[in-house]
Interface confidence: low
């Protein structure tokens, strides 16, 4: 029986050209997380495997950074990045849990865009 629940950043907005952090957390289960997939609609963005670490899809490697934690950082946002994002937790023995985040990328207003930073 699957007892876990996923908490996510939910519906979020960001400005064109900026960056955003997507985060999910699986709770209320003792199941072992073997892998987390991050997907945008039907496209795979990144995988975090418990044994092998992170893999970023080649088509996103210039704009996607792993972390913090099991989260994902999207950079240099465009209006085309608007849409649904999914964190898919593969666990044993429970199976698969999925969290949904909706991102809306807005046309830039007058904004001070963030400095570069390092995600461990």
């Amino acid at each position: 029986m699957m007892t876990g629940t996923i908490e996510t950043t939910g519906n979020i907005s960001a400005e064109k050209g900026g960056s955003i952090i997507l985060q999910c957390h699986l709770s209320s289960t003792t199941a072992q997380v073997t892998q987390v997939n991050w997907e945008q609609q039907d496209q795979l963005l990144a995988i975090c495997n418990a044994d092998l670490g992170w893999h970023i899809s080649p088509s996103f490697k210039d704009r996607v950074a792993p972390g913090p934690g099991l989260g994902l950082t999207l950079q240099s946002l465009t209006v085309n990045d608007t849409g649904e994002y999914f964190c898919i937790y593969h666990t044993y023995p429970d199976g698969t849990y999925t969290g949904r985040i909706f991102l809306e990328v807005l046309e830039s207003s007058v904004a001070e865009h963030g400095a570069r930073f390092q995600i461990p």
């Epitope: 950043t9 979020i12 907005s13 952090i21 904004a111 001070e112």
Partner: nanobody, 113 residues
Framework: EVQLVESGGGLVQPGGSLRLSCAAS????????MGWFRQAPGKEREWVAS???????WYADSVKGRFTISADNSKNTAYLQMNSLKPEDTAVYYC???????WGQGTLVTVSS
């Protein structure tokens, strides 16, 4: 006007404590995520901790067990309680929201005897 204002930094001896605050104002939507970053002299800005609106927290390995992040959603304010400070925690500390588009001036934390 959009603003993130950090405060609470200062000079503290190794093993001491500080509590940082970050007040966010002027935003049209409330953040689902708030976090703290830091930048030591000559280094890139690095993530320290973050908290979801629902209360779940994440920490960089270097601060786990020593730092505690929290947020008061009604005030759009985030806090970072820093205990057992080490000289390597010396840095300018910045807070951020989920969009990472806005940064304040930061608050300097110096850990030295």
């Amino acid at each position: 006007e959009v603003q993130l204002v950090e405060s609470g930094g200062g000079l503290v001896q190794p093993g001491g404590s500080l509590r940082l605050s970050c007040a966010a104002s002027g935003f049209t939507f409330s953040p689902s995520w708030m976090g703290w970053f830091r930048q030591a002299p000559g280094k890139e800005r690095e993530w320290v901790a973050s908290v979801l609106r629902g209360g779940y927290t994440w920490y960089a390995d270097s601060v786990k067990g020593r730092f505690t992040i929290s947020a008061d959603n009604s005030k759009n304010t985030a806090y970072l309680q820093m205990n057992s400070l080490k000289p390597e925690d010396t840095a300018v500390y910045y807070c951020a929201r989920d969009d990472l588009d806005y940064w304040g001036q930061g608050t300097l934390v110096t850990v030295s005897s």
